[in-house]
Structure formats: structure tokens, C-alpha cells
Interface confidence: low
């Protein structure tokens, strides 16, 4: 009769690709044993005496290995084998999207280890240890509250990661100001302006995570383009949560996104979810009511476009109101496109 295990199995971690020899507990080398993994008999050619030899370990080798006396089927030993990798240097980043309340740090491993990892985060402000409160929802994130504002003392955040096969660590040092990055503006809506074929009214809201917009005002960056073109127009706005686009092309569907930044410090947010709208058109479009509604009302889609960078803020790049189309857009030489051209420039 096969006995159920009486003792907890020995837990063993081994590196992916390595070779491992599993002894059958204290059994003699020449004892007659049978090995099973997860209840399935293993081939005798994997044995070296009573020992089980596994070469070139793969993830599929993980499992519960048990060896039995071949005659009595008495369980001699069991090993819970986990195949994995030691951790590589973790990726650590910190960001303040709730300035001036505090900031959060998040981390991840660049490659999986396939076995449990333990992370330890230390936050120093100067030499003072700060509490990093675990995020209730995200296990790879913790939050730090500021004690003082406008501190010239640098923060140093260190993270160490260890598992049964190894250890690694990394650290970053930064000033309070450099990690300030608001969340994107919310509820971006674009609407046509009746009887104005070249206008679109865009409105948005300050990100709800930004706690004190009166004391720490945001500025905004708006980009827009007709769907048929790849070239964005940019407008930087020092305040307000609305803007009227005055140079849109009649009847062309536009995509509009907004980003936010603290007036003085930090970096631009990621782009908001995109809003779509088509300027008001005078003549009937011979569309079904449903299609017309879809073309003239706002809808939202996610955008994969990168966020603004410091380069975008170059005033020299923001001054042009012309729509410059490159040869990639048109398949020909670079030229300024007119409204008349646009009416004949169909979707690709």
C-alpha cells in the first residue's frame, strides 16, 4: 500500500539550466527506490543509484518529487523543487502626482524569476529614514509623505530584492522637484462650434489626484491634428481648462489631447485620453443620421502617442500656426498644405 506523506516535503530551489541531484533522504546509494514527480513515475535512466539526476533544468521540472522503497512503496523522502532564476537589478522609479502631499515609488524586475521574491525599500531624506507606506492595491508600490516642502535635501530610495537563488539591489537619488509629474487632465471633451466651420471648443478638468491647484497651479499643453495627417499642432496654455481651436479644417475629424505640468517644477504629464470631434459643416454631408452623429460628437479613445517632452516646450517650435506636411505624409516633396488640398487629401 502507498502511504501518504507524513512529513512536510523538503523545499529546494534550483537555477534554471543547471543540473541537480536529489538524494532519496537518508537511503543508501544502492537502495532500490522509485521516484515520482507529481504522482507520475520517472524513468529509471534518470537515477544514479537511489539518487535522481535532473540535467538542464527547465521550468517544467518544478514539482513535488517523491522517492519510495520499490518493494514496500514506503515513502522515504519528498522534495518540492522550484526552478527559477536569481533576480536581476530591479527597475525603480519615483513620482509625485499628488504634489505637495508626497510621492510614490514603484519597482519591478526586468525579467521574471519564477520563484518568490522579497523586496525591501528604504527611503532616506538626507540621513533620515522615511516611512514608505505599502500601497493597499499595488504590491510593488509604496508611498512617502513630505514632512517639509521645498527641501534642498536629496531623497535616496534604495531597493533590494532577494530570493532563494540570489540577491540584487539598486538605488536612485533625486530632488523633491524633479519627480513632480501630474496625472493627465481628465474628461477631455471637444465640441464643434455652431456656424463656425474652423472652430472646436476643447474643455478638460484638472487631474483629480492633484490636491491643491490653487496653491500649485497647473499649466496645460494641447495638441491636435486631423485624423488624415500625422503632424500635430501644439498650444501651450498658462491657465484655464478650456481652449478654442480656431484653425481647424471644416468637415475633418480631429483628435485632441491635453497634458498638464506644475507651473514651475517637474515634468509634463502623459497625454490625456484622446477626444475626437469634427468641426461644424454647412452643407449636408449625405450621411445617415447615425453616421453624422458619430462624426460630430465627441468620443474618446486611448492614445499611444508619447507625452510632451522638454523639446516640445521650445518656444521656437510652438510659434508656427501653419500645417506643415512632410514627404512621409504625402509621398512627395515637403510643402505647405492648403485647406483646398485638405479637402482632396483622403484617408490613407
Amino acid at each position: 500500500q502507498r502511504h501518504s506523506p507524513q512529513e512536510a516535503p523538503h523545499v529546494q530551489y534550483e537555477r534554471l539550466g543547471s543540473d541537480v541531484t536529489l538524494p532519496c533522504g537518508t537511503a543508501n546509494w544502492d537502495a532500490a527506490v522509485t521516484w515520482r514527480v507529481n504522482g507520475t513515475d520517472l524513468a529509471p535512466d534518470l537515477l544514479n543509484g537511489s539518487q535522481l539526476v535532473l540535467r538542464g533544468l527547465e521550468l517544467g521540472h518544478s514539482g513535488l518529487y517523491a522517492c519510495f522503497h520499490r518493494d514496500s512503496w514506503h515513502l522515504r523522502h519528498q522534495v518540492l523543487l522550484h526552478v527559477g532564476l536569481p533576480p536581476r537589478e530591479p527597475v525603480l522609479s519615483c513620482r509625485s502626482n499628488t504634489y505637495p502631499k508626497g510621492f510614490y515609488c514603484s519597482w519591478h524586475l526586468p525579467t521574471p524569476t519564477y520563484i518568490p521574491n522579497t523586496f525591501n525599500v528604504t527611503v532616506l531624506h538626507g540621513s533620515k529614514i522615511m516611512v514608505c507606506e505599502k500601497d493597499p492595491a499595488l504590491k510593488n508600490r509604496c508611498h512617502i509623505r513630505y514632512m517639509h516642502l521645498f527641501s534642498t535635501i536629496k531623497y535616496k530610495v534604495s531597493i533590494s530584492v532577494s530570493n532563494a537563488l540570489g540577491h540584487n539591489a539598486t538605488a536612485i537619488t533625486f530632488d523633491e522637484f524633479t519627480i513632480v509629474k501630474p496625472d493627465p487632465p481628465e474628461n477631455v471633451v471637444a465640441r464643434p462650434v455652431p456656424s463656425n466651420p474652423r472652430r472646436l471648443e476643447v474643455t478638460w478638468q484638472i487631474p483629480s489626484t492633484w490636491p491643491d491647484p490653487e496653491s500649485f497651479p497647473l499649466k496645460f499643453f494641447l495638441r491636435y491634428r486631423p485624423l488624415i495627417l500625422d503632424q500635430w499642432q501644439h498650444v501651450e496654455l498658462s491657465d484655464g481648462t478650456a481652449h478654442t481651436i480656431t484653425d481647424a479644417y471644416a468637415g475633418k475629424e480631429y483628435i485632441i489631447q491635453v497634458a498638464a505640468k506644475d507651473n514651475e517644477i517637474g515634468t509634463w504629464s502623459d497625454w490625456s485620453v484622446a477626444a475626437h470631434a469634427t468641426p461644424w459643416t454647412e452643407e449636408p454631408r449625405h450621411l445617415t443620421t447615425e453616421a453624422q452623429a458619430a462624426e460630430t460628437t465627441t468620443s474618446t479613445t486611448s492614445s499611444l502617442a508619447p507625452p510632451p517632452t522638454t523639446k516640445i516646450c521650445d518656444p521656437g517650435e510652438l510659434g508656427s500656426e501653419q500645417k506643415l506636411i512632410s514627404e512621409e505624409d504625402l509621398g512627395g516633396e515637403q510643402k505647405l498644405i492648403s485647406e483646398e488640398d485638405l479637402h482632396h487629401h483622403h484617408h490613407h
Epitope: P100, S127, R145, H148, L149, F150, S151, I153
Partner: antibody, heavy 120, light 108 residues
Framework: QVQLVESGGDVVQPGRSLRLSCAAS????????MHWVRQPPGKGLEWVTI????????YYADSVKGRFTISRDNSKNTVFLQMNSLRTEDTGFYYC?????????????WGQGTLVTVSS | DIQMTQSPSSLSASVGDRVTITCRAS??????LNWYQQKPGKAPKLLIY???SLQSGVPSRFSGSGSGTDFTLTISSLQPEDFATYYC??????????FGQGTRLEIK
């Protein structure tokens, strides 16, 4: 110029309560962590408590933990110290102080102090 | 908590003397040490921060030195207005912030 003005000091019996106030002016109060530091008559300085710039964090010396509560009202540029279950050893001058935000931290601004006497 | 010990507890000196006050921390505090001067009935006043940096407006006869656990406040030539009590304070491991017990400097 910078001013911190404490008030509320008084003579009270052991076990009673007292509330101290510190009114700040001349600097951006809402950016600074604020402390209370006390000094028994003829003795040295003892740090009592700190409150972070936004009131979210508070720390206390072991000698007052559970009895004293620090709070602040940034709209009124004022920090408070609620002192309950007062003991004779709480007697002394109580100073409010604003901590520097530069490295390393030190007490940048001090009030003139208010005297608390706990006596039966 | 880090303990701060000042010596001497009191000191008598004359105008023009060079005076040294020492402060020892119970563990290394790097350069996170500040010195204050307090006159009777007045609030403390910052003299030196970060062990050796002179606070703006403080006379150059005051200087600070040291790192780790041992620190020194030196007054190169005592003036009548320097007779007061001096405190060291660590800001390495806070809270709690801890002060030395004070050194009383009296006229001889």
C-alpha cells in the same frame, strides 16, 4: 520679518488641560514643519513634537505621547499644542519653532516662548 | 534615540579668551549637528549648522568643527555679549530631535 508668537500659557493644576497657540507671520507657513520645544525653569531644551507642513504627520517625544496633541490651521498660519493630563514635570517655557527646509535640518525660526506652570 | 553630551556643563572665562565647548553623540551623526546660543529670558538663536557652517549674521569669532561623534564649538575671542548658554542639537536621526544638556558660559 519673521515672527512666531506663542500664547495660552497659564498656571494649571496637575491633571488639567491647556491649549497653546503659535501664530506665524513673515514666511510661508504652509511650507514648513512646525515644532514645539520646551524648557523647564533653569534647565535645558527638550524637543516635544513636530507636525508636517500639511498636518498629515505628527511625532511626539515619549514623555508626552498620548497626552499632547499637535495640530495646525494653515489658513490661519497657526499651530496648536493641546496638552491634557498635565504633570508637574510639564512645567516650563514652551517655544514653537519652524524647521528649516534646507540641509541639514535645524530650527530656523523661534517664538519668544510662553510659560506653562503645573502646580497644585 | 541618540544622546548628546556636552562638556563642560559650565565654564568661566574672561573677555578676549578663546573658549571651546565640546559635544559628543552616542552614535555617529555625520555632520548633522547644530549649535544654538540662548540668553536668559530669550529664545535660542542658531549659530552653527551642519557642524561647521556659520549662520548668516553670526560673528566670525564663532566656529564649529567635528564629524561623526565628536564636535566642537569655538569662540576665538570672547566678547561681553557672548556670555550665555550654548546647546548642541543633532538632526541625524529624527524624530526625536535631541539636544545636549547645555553649557553655561559665565564671566570670570
Amino acid at each position: 520679518q519673521v515672527q512666531l508668537v506663542e500664547s495660552g500659557g497659564d498656571v494649571v493644576q496637575p491633571g488639567r488641560s491647556l491649549r497653546l497657540s503659535c501664530a506665524a507671520s513673515g514666511f510661508t507657513f504652509s511650507y514648513y514643519g512646525m515644532h514645539w520645544v520646551r524648557q523647564p525653569p533653569g534647565k535645558g531644551l527638550e524637543w516635544v513634537t513636530i507636525i508636517s507642513f500639511d498636518g498629515s504627520q505628527k511625532y511626539y517625544a515619549d514623555s508626552v505621547k498620548g497626552r499632547f496633541t499637535i495640530s495646525r490651521d494653515n489658513s490661519k498660519n497657526t499651530v496648536f499644542l493641546q496638552m491634557n493630563s498635565l504633570r508637574t514635570e510639564d512645567t516650563g517655557f514652551y517655544y514653537c519653532a519652524a524647521q528649516s527646509s534646507t540641509w541639514p535640518e535645524y530650527f530656523q525660526y523661534w517664538g519668544q516662548g510662553t510659560l506653562v506652570t503645573v502646580s497644585s | 534615540d541618540i544622546q548628546m553630551t556636552q562638556s563642560p556643563s559650565s565654564l568661566s572665562a574672561s573677555v578676549g579668551d578663546r573658549v571651546t565647548i565640546t559635544c559628543r553623540a552616542s552614535q555617529s551623526i555625520s555632520s548633522y549637528l547644530n549649535w544654538y546660543q540662548q540668553k536668559p529670558g530669550k529664545a535660542p538663536k542658531l549659530l552653527i549648522y551642519a557642524a561647521s557652517s556659520l549662520q548668516s549674521g553670526v560673528p566670525s569669532r564663532f566656529s564649529g568643527s567635528g564629524s561623526g561623534t565628536d564636535f566642537t564649538l569655538t569662540i576665538s575671542s570672547l566678547q561681553p555679549e557672548d556670555f550665555a548658554t550654548y546647546y548642541c542639537q543633532q538632526s541625524y536621526s529624527t524624530p526625536p530631535i535631541t539636544f545636549g544638556q547645555g553649557t553655561r558660559l559665565e564671566i570670570k
